[in-house]
């Protein structure tokens, strides 16, 4: 009785169970009743990641430095290669198959977390008590200066853009 | 690069026996079932015998049932066919070829058998 | 058993012509697991067309197989000098055995 399920790592082919290819080969021939399933190893530029039944293997992924694509990790017979994006520049993607420059946080942002290779730059309002001057994909928010650690006092509130202002006491006159 | 090579052949009176081998180089012998394929002088392709990749599966030709037997060492990558009891009808050029589904993708150059008293 | 049957059995042609062989079975080829092939004096067979219509490796596409069930074709699209040789069927779905047709001679006219 022919079979109409197989079990794992084979396939179903004209009645007949096969076992697939490993990981790193392509088929090549089913199997017959006399022979097992012919498979090849992928070319040095292809990969296949599965147990597989493919008659062709993929293509590594290029990381076209053109995108500003580098390799992080150079594809293997079972892995593809993996790209990350240059200084500067993240994904745009999961797949990661173009970069774009790390957002700058506004003043009255600060810098959340870095931006890596694969993330953007996540950014924060400046809660009170701090500000952000500047325009940056660096700069966290800053506290506001302690005029009273200086014997100074406030002169100018600060706001999420600005620091306080600190000067001297008013002398009071005898 | 992918070779079977036949020997054994020659020339035997009827009734007596001999012994076919095919060498095969430049692919995983161990992986692929064989094939005894004859051919009579002036005459088409007849198939003989098969035996699956690990030994265990063998089929015949009516003609050739009970007096042949295909047989293979995997350790030294050769097929072999013993026959017995010949006839002067088994005269023929003995080709070994490797089964796929595909059909039979390489053959050797074949070696001549001739029964004759 | 499936008995192969060829036909013609010799074909004369000029070279740049057209070859059509003929193979009739006598019940159906499961999977069209039907083979094609070539063989020339003193030479051994040479694997052309599988499975009814696939071109094995390195044979050029003037070689073509078609049909299914028990009715199939072998066609030389422009005959070539090296074309000019003996063409064998063989089904290898219903075994055993596995059956070669009687072979049709390709020769010049």
């Known amino acids: 009785e022919p079979p109409t399920a197989c079990r794992e790592k084979q396939y179903l082919i004209n009645s007949q169970c096969c076992s697939l290819c490993q990981p790193g080969q392509k088929l090549v021939s089913d199997c017959t009743e006399f022979t097992e399933t012919e498979c090849l190893p992928c070319s040095e530029s292809e990969f296949l990641d599965t147990w597989n039944r493919e008659t062709r293997c993929h293509q590594h992924k290029y990381c076209d430095p053109n995108l500003g694509l580098q390799v992080q990790q150079k594809g293997t017979s079972e892995t593809d290669t993996i790209c990350t994006c240059e200084e500067g520049l993240h994904c745009t993607s999961e797949s990661c198959e173009s970069c774009v420059p790390h957002r700058s946080c506004l003043p009255g942002f600060g810098v959340k977390q870095i931006a890596t290779g694969v993330s953007d730059t996540i950014c924060e309002p400046c809660p009170v008590g701090f500000f952000s001057n500047v325009s940056s994909a660096f700069e966290k928010c800053r506290p506001w200066t302690s005029c009273e650690t200086k014997d100074l006092v406030v002169q100018q509130a600060g706001t999420n853009k600005t620091d306080v202002v600190c000067g001297p006491q008013d002398r009071q006159r005898a | 690069q992918v070779q079977l090579v036949e020997s054994g052949g020659g020339v035997v009176q009827p009734g007596r026996s001999l012994r076919l081998s095919c060498a095969a180089s430049g692919f995983t012998f161990e992986k692929y079932g064989m094939h005894w394929v004859r051919q009579a002088p002036g005459k088409g392709l007849e198939w003989v015998a098969v035996?699956?990749?690990?030994?265990?599966?063998?089929y015949y030709a009516d003609s050739v049932k009970g007096r042949f037997t295909i047989s293979r060492d995997n350790s030294k990558n050769t097929l072999y066919l013993q026959m017995n009891s010949l006839r002067a009808e088994d005269t023929a050029v003995y080709y070994c070829a490797r089964d796929t589904s595909r059909g039979h993708d390489i053959w050797g150059q074949g070696t001549m058998v001739t029964v004759s008293s | 058993e499936i008995v192969l049957t060829q036909s013609p059995g010799t074909l004369s042609l000029s070279p740049g012509e057209r070859a059509t062989l003929s193979c009739q079975a006598s019940q159906s080829v499961s999977y069209n697991y039907l083979a094609w092939y070539q063989q020339k004096p003193g030479q051994a067979p040479r694997l052309l067309i599988y499975?009814?219509?696939s071109r094995n490796n390195g044979i050029p596409d003037r070689f073509s197989g078609s049909g299914s069930g028990t009715d199939f074709t072998l066609t030389i699209s422009r005959l070539e000098p090296e074309d000019f040789a003996v063409y064998y069927c063989?089904?290898?779905?219903?075994?055993?055995?596995?059956?070669f047709g009687g072979g049709t001679k390709v020769e010049i006219k």
């Open positions: 063989q089904q290898y779905s219903d075994y055993p055995p596995f059956t």
């Open positions: 035996i699956s990749y690990e030994g265990t599966s063998k």
């Open positions: 499975g009814a219509s």
